[in-house]
């Protein structure tokens, strides 16, 4: 039975040209995290593999930095970066846990962070 929950940074906003940290945290399970995927809609941005470390997709290498921790830093944000991001935790023995973050990239200087929320 899967007992874990993923806590994410929820709905967040950031300024065009700036940076943002996407963060997820898996709790309430003793399962071993074997790999964390960061995905945007139908694209793979980066992977942190327990054995192989971080790998960034070639098309995002210039704008994506690993960390902090299992999180992901997006840099030089554009309005096209607005959308859903997913952290996918592959764990053993539990299986897969998925967290969702919605990022809005704003033209203006008004960018506020949303509240945290949980996905069971």
């Amino acid at each position: 039975m899967m007992t874990g929950t993923i806590e994410t940074t929820g709905n967040i906003s950031a300024e065009k040209g700036g940076s943002i940290i996407l963060q997820c945290h898996l709790s309430s399970t003793t399962a071993q995290v074997t790999q964390v995927n960061w995905e945007q809609q139908d694209q793979l941005l980066a992977i942190c593999n327990a054995d192989l470390g971080w790998h960034i997709s070639p098309s995002f290498k210039d704008r994506v930095a690993p960390g902090p921790g299992l999180g992901l830093t997006l840099q030089s944000l554009t309005v096209n970066d607005t959308g859903e991001y997913f952290c996918i935790y592959h764990t053993y023995p539990d299986g897969t846990y998925t967290g969702r973050i919605f990022l809005e990239v704003l033209e203006s200087s008004v960018a506020e962070h949303g509240a945290r929320f949980q996905i069971p």
């Epitope: 995927n37 995905e39 593999n49 790998h55 997709s57 592959h90 023995p93």
Partner: antibody
Framework: EVQLVQSGAEVKKPGSSVKVSCKAS????????ISWVRQAPGQGLEWMGG????????DVAEKFQGRVTITADTSTNTVYIELSSLRSEDTAVYYC???????????????WGRGTLVTVSS | QSALTQPRSVSGSPGQSVTISCTGT?????????VSWYQQHPGKAPKLMIY???YRPSEISNRFSGSKSGNTASLTISGLQAEDEADYYC??????????FGAGTKLTVL
């Protein structure tokens, strides 16, 4: 449309080698691992190994280590398996299969090639 | 010899439900949720029906369901139809030994 297209049937002599190809299309090739699964006539499925182009990581089942080489050509979106020192028991249909999830976790396969029959006979 | 034990054959009449079992050990099926089921018609490639014990790919009918109890995983097919006649294979995945398949079960629709 996501698909895996495999090379044609082969007839080989015992002791020789065979190389089967699997060309992927319709998705971002490097993001998904591809495994090779074989099926001898009238028998069950047997996982041989797989490759994750994203990491360029290759895993081979213990039974086939030393006899199997799996490679990927990202310029043509093609994965290859080469099996050496062939014997009659290697006669089988060889399938390539794509991982269900990105990143090469390899626990389930959602897209399969149509299979390549390799016959080993003297 | 496969590490996962399946019955050689099962059968059922149209409209009935059938269950196919897949028995492993406390080291594989009993210890994790990475159990998948595949359907294979004669001369065709396998098709993924269930993954992670009980999850169905979006295109698979909800007549197919998966479950697990102890060291045994099960595939249940309800409202049996003629086109369900096929071979069914379970598989178990562990990061160390990768994927192992069961020997397969032939389902006959009477």
């Amino acid at each position: 449309e996501v698909q895996l297209v495999q090379s044609g049937a082969e007839v080989k002599k015992p002791g020789s080698s065979v190389k089967v190809s699997c060309k992927a299309s319709g998705y971002t090739f490097a993001s998904y691992g591809i495994s090779w699964v074989r099926q001898a006539p009238g028998q069950g499925l047997e996982w041989m190994g797989g490759i994750t182009p994203f990491f360029n990581r290759v895993d081979v089942a213990e039974k086939f280590q030393g006899r199997v080489t799996i490679t990927a050509d990202t310029s043509t979106n093609t994965v290859y398996i080469e099996l050496s020192s062939l014997r009659s028991e290697d006669t089988a249909v060889y399938y390539c299969a794509r991982d269900l999830r990105r990143g090469g976790v390899g626990d389930a396969f959602d897209i399969w090639g149509r299979g390549t029959l390799v016959t080993v006979s003297s | 010899q496969s590490a996962l034990t399946q019955p050689r054959s099962v059968s059922g009449s149209p409209g009935q439900s059938v269950t196919i079992s897949c028995t492993g050990t406390s080291s594989d099926v009993g210890s994790h949720n990475y159990v998948s089921w595949y359907q294979q018609h004669p001369g065709k490639a396998p098709k993924l029906m269930i993954y992670e014990v009980s999850y169905r790919p979006s295109e698979i009918s909800n007549r197919f369901s998966g479950s697990k109890s102890g060291n045994t995983a099960s595939l249940t097919i309800s409202g049996l139809q003629a086109e369900d006649e096929a071979d069914y294979y379970c598989s178990s995945y562990t990061p160390s030994s990768a994927t192992v398949f069961g020997a397969g079960t032939k389902l006959t629709v009477l």
